[in-house]
Interface confidence: low
């Protein structure tokens, strides 16, 4: 048969994953030893899987010795649970749905998981996991999600001079490693470069036929979907005009699985007050109430009046909900017709991913 390509020694990756799994652990807290041992066992498993490729590699051998030393020091047993797995699961461990959404807790109710939705589009408009809707400034790099399973960060840039409105031109998504299911995978998109692959060139995570994580290109260079079966999570990334939009569905128990130090997450807590574009009654609704707010940086851009913007948005979004209002806001702020498509696709993404139909159309509230 064909010669196999030599695989790369991945000890650095194993070590990085171990550091990522243990950096947040508090040695004074209850359960530290058991969590540390879980991570050590995952580290050991990772080094075993890369052992052939690392033959003769000093870093690899010192890591193996280091693991052995740590196992002894911490009184860790060689057998037992590893990080991010549930040892009692008898179904497919890399399919979140196959074990009722229960993860890292022995037993418990096998209730179907409660899903949460978060979306970001336009100027940018944020729909949080709590179905709160905000228009934010958030210029520069900001985390939407930063939990034990997934990190999503966006970079926003000013859309027009003299306005605090920004839009997203870069998205970075880190699907964190889970023993036996997938190595850590990083996805990055920038305006005019929306790849259908992770940064390492692969299109899936997981061994062999177990596609625990995969990317689907729906529209070349314009729309990709990421399906992470192992964490029951779906992410849509689109480019409309010059900017990117994001829609994410994730099980509640995973979305809320984060450390105190990870509480700057726009999807969880919304925008910081200082980053809200708001005049106290909701800037978007103020515009549509035919009175532009006093403190706002919104200005009717040449080419759109409130009437023409409303007409154009109404064609795509017959329900005058927050998506319609955001569309009008963006047209008046930027004069860029692509924001109509962004608001429309954001609503389509809600309908595809949001678990509760009665909450698809929401109406304005202030920051």
């Amino acid at each position: 048969g064909d010669c196999q390509q030599p695989t790369q020694c991945r000890i650095q990756k194993c070590t990085t994953d171990f550091v990522a799994l243990t950096a947040h652990l508090n040695s004074a807290a209850d359960g530290f030893d058991s969590e540390f041992c879980k991570a050590l066992r995952a580290y050991a498993g990772c080094t075993q899987r890369t052992s052939k490729a690392c033959r003769g590699n000093l870093v690899y051998h010192s890591a193996v010795l280091g693991i052995s030393d740590l196992m002894s020091q911490r009184n860790c047993s060689k057998d037992g649970p590893t990080s991010s797995t549930n040892p009692e699961v008898t179904h497919d461990p890399c399919n979140y749905h196959s074990h009722g959404g229960v993860r890292e807790h022995g037993g418990g109710d096998q209730r179907p998981p409660n899903y949460l939705f978060c979306g970001l589009f336009g100027d940018p408009h944020l729909r949080t996991f709590k179905d709160h809707f905000q228009t934010c400034k958030v210029e520069g790099a900001w985390p939407l999600i930063d939990n034990n399973y997934l990190s999503v960060q966006v970079t926003n840039v000013p859309v027009v001079p003299g306005s605090s409105a920004t839009a997203t031109n870069k998205v970075t998504i880190i699907f964190k490693a889970q023993h036996e299911c997938t190595d850590q995978k990083v996805y990055q998109a920038v305006t005019d470069d929306l790849p259908a692959a992770f940064v390492d060139g692969t299109t899936s995570g997981g061994d062999g036929d177990v596609k625990s994580l995969h990317i689907v290109e729906k529209e070349s260079g314009r729309y990709v979907e990421m399906h992470a079966r192992y964490i029951g999570t779906t992410v849509f990334v689109r480019q409309l005009g010059r900017y990117l939009t994001l829609a994410i569905r994730m099980p509640e128990d995973l979305a809320m699985s984060y450390e105190e130090s990870q509480d700057l997450q726009l999807c969880v807590n919304g925008c910081p007050m200082s980053e809200c574009i708001d005049d106290g009654q909701g800037q978007v609704s103020a515009i549509l109430g035919h009175s532009l707010p006093h403190t706002t940086s919104v200005q009717a851009w040449p080419g759109y009046t409130l009437e023409t913007a409303s007409t154009q948005c109404h064609e795509k979004m017959p329900v005058k909900d927050i998506y319609f209002q955001s569309c009008v806001f963006d047209l008046l702020t930027t004069g860029d017709a692509n924001f109509t498509a962004a608001a429309h696709s954001a609503l389509e993404d809600v309908e595809a991913l949001h678990p509760r139909k009665e909450r698809w159309h929401i109406f304005p509230s202030s920051c």
Epitope: T16, V19, A20, A23, G140, A141, Q153, T155, V157, P158, P161, N169, K170, T172, V190, T191, D192, D193, S261, Q262, D263, L264
Partner: antibody, heavy 117, light 106 residues
Framework: QVQLQQSGTELVKPGSSVKISCKAS????????MHWIRQQPGSGLEWIGW????????KYNQKFDGKATLTADKSSSTAYLQLSLLTSEDYAVYFC??????????WGQGVMVTVSS | DIQMTQSPSHLSASVGDRVTLSCKVS??????LNWYQQKLGEAPKLLIY???FLQTGIPSRFSGSGSGTDYTLTISSLQPEDVATYFC????????FGGGTKLELK
């Protein structure tokens, strides 16, 4: 592979201005933030500001307001730092660096600016 | 302003030593912290980003950890080529570098 090539050493007189350049190659210049960082002799690093070449937007460390001006030329993929009303306090190495997420992954080699009469 | 304090400012260690450098911040920066290495006459080089992620091509003897206000860079087994100054840098609520730790061989 991204490379940031900075202009050469500058010897300037007090009270004058200097404009140093940072030419980017191998990546999309317009879609990344370009930062400038100062390092005085034997000292730490100080952030001056950034420019987003795609639209020319800038943000400065308050300390450098009125001292530093950042510009960019998209056609040549070059970012510029202009320092005005130079004094001996401005004697330093000035680096440009590209921002990815929250970190600076590529740096120029640095430009030494010496202020002397 | 958020203050960043690196300690020690100077450190001498032997080849093979485990070396730990500290970066303390005056308020929570939510792990938004990077580490750089700067050798004499060179530009800084990224080692660790977002507290604990190893930058591509950096040896695995470098690792980072921490949260809240206390952050650490560890060199598990010091090598001669690690002689340099190490800077931490935050990117939460502004871009600021620590004062640096100069690492030398005994």
């Amino acid at each position: 592979q991204v490379q940031l090539q900075q202009s050469g050493t500058e010897l300037v007189k007090p009270g004058s201005s200097v404009k140093i350049s940072c030419k980017a190659s191998g990546d999309t210049f317009t879609s990344d933030y370009m930062h400038w960082i100062r390092q005085q002799p034997g000292s730490g690093l100080e952030w001056i500001g950034w420019i987003y070449p795609g639209n020319g937007n800038t943000k400065y460390n308050q300390k450098f307001d009125g001292k530093a001006t950042l510009t960019a030329d998209k056609s040549s993929s070059t970012a510029y730092l202009q320092l005005s009303l130079l004094t001996s306090e401005d004697y330093a190495v000035y680096f440009c660096a590209r921002q990815t997420e929250g970190y600076f992954d590529y740096w120029g080699q640095g430009v030494m600016v010496t202020v002397s009469s | 302003d958020i203050q960043m304090t690196q300690s020690p400012s100077h450190l001498s260690a032997s080849v093979g030593d485990r070396v730990t450098l500290s970066c303390k911040v005056s308020q929570n920066i939510y792990k938004y912290l990077n580490w750089y290495q700067q050798k004499l006459g060179e530009a800084p080089k990224l080692l660790i980003y977002y507290t604990s992620f190893l930058q591509t091509g950096i040896p695995s003897r470098f690792s980072g950890s921490g949260s809240g206000t206390d952050y650490t860079l560890t060199i598990s087994s010091l090598q001669p080529e690690d002689v340099a100054t190490y800077f931490c840098q935050k990117y939460y609520s502004g871009w600021t570098f620590g004062g640096g730790t100069k690492l030398e061989l005994k």
